[in-house]
């Protein structure tokens, strides 16, 4: 049985300065090349090492790019989006949607979006047990008074 995976969606404005090798990332998606089913949006497929995006550090692989210099990326062919980035100029403003994976699964299941490696039950069970022991000890102590 798999856990239910939820996503925490946040938006961010990222300003990049074009480097010698461009903006330093690859994109996928578009109306003619859907990356996510039922979504023709433009997604970051790869961040190039030592490129402008990697050095900035905020853009992540899997991020959805909503706009470039205020130009909406909805319903674009893939190559139209590529050319928009290519001709966006030296200073480029990106509106980006990050999706942080959150695990709400069955006990003991650890999702890839939970990097800490401590399932919540491992914290809750001892706390609950301690509370019960404390309550039992308190009741016994009261009875002795």
């Amino acid at each position: 049985m798999n856990g239910r995976v939820d996503y925490l969606v946040t938006e961010e404005e990222i300003n990049l300065t074009r480097g010698p090798s461009g903006l330093g990332f690859n994109i996928v998606g578009g109306t003619d090349q859907q990356y996510v089913s039922n979504d023709s949006g433009i997604y970051v497929s790869r961040i190039k090492e030592n490129g402008a995006a990697a050095l900035d550090g905020r853009l992540q692989e899997g991020d959805k790019i909503l706009s470039v210099n205020g130009q909406d990326l909805k319903n674009l062919l893939h190559q139209d989006a590529v050319d928009l980035f290519r001709n966006a100029g030296y200073a480029v403003s990106l509106r980006v949607q990050h999706r942080l994976q959150v695990q709400n699964g069955p006990i003991g299941h650890r999702g890839e979006g939970d990097p800490s490696g401590i399932p919540i039950f491992m914290v809750l069970v001892p706390v609950f047990a301690l509370t019960m022991v404390a309550a039992w000890a308190f009741m016994r102590y009261r009875q002795q008074l």
Epitope: D32, L76, L77
Partner: nanobody, 124 residues
């Protein structure tokens, strides 16, 4: 994959007419241009049209004899050529601007990133 496919070329008598078509796929909202290249000569600008179809420019050698148009629903550009002369004999190329929704049309060959294979026009 971006593709531009020209059609409509052929052999025509001097004074005759031809209508060339250019079907575009893989890109949209592009300024479109027609260029031609005669044997042993450089590629020459013929005509261009804005992505919205509201603005056109023409090369000096064809002014008044050709009309460029487009049908965005079909993603196709056209070149209507009248009063053809033997010196119009060339391979005619269709090209799409490398910029998405570019502001100004241009005769500058360097701005056209996408090219068709060309269609031969021979005027006898």
């Amino acid at each position: 994959e971006v593709q531009l496919v020209e059609s409509g070329g052929g052999l025509v008598q001097a004074g005759g007419s031809l209508r060339l078509s250019c079907a575009v796929s893989g890109v949209s909202f592009r300024n479109m241009g027609w260029f031609r290249q005669a044997p042993g000569k450089e590629r020459e600008f013929v005509a261009a049209i804005s992505w919205g179809g509201d603005s056109t420019i023409y090369g000096d050698s064809v002014k008044g004899r050709v009309t460029i148009s487009r049908d965005n629903a079909k993603n196709t550009a056209y070149l209507e050529m009248n009063s053809l002369k033997p010196e119009d004999t060339a391979v005619y190329y269709c090209a799409a601007d490398g910029r998405f929704r570019a502001g100004r049309i241009s005769s500058d060959l360097g701005l056209y990133h996408y090219w068709g294979q060309g269609t031969q026009v021979t005027v006898s």
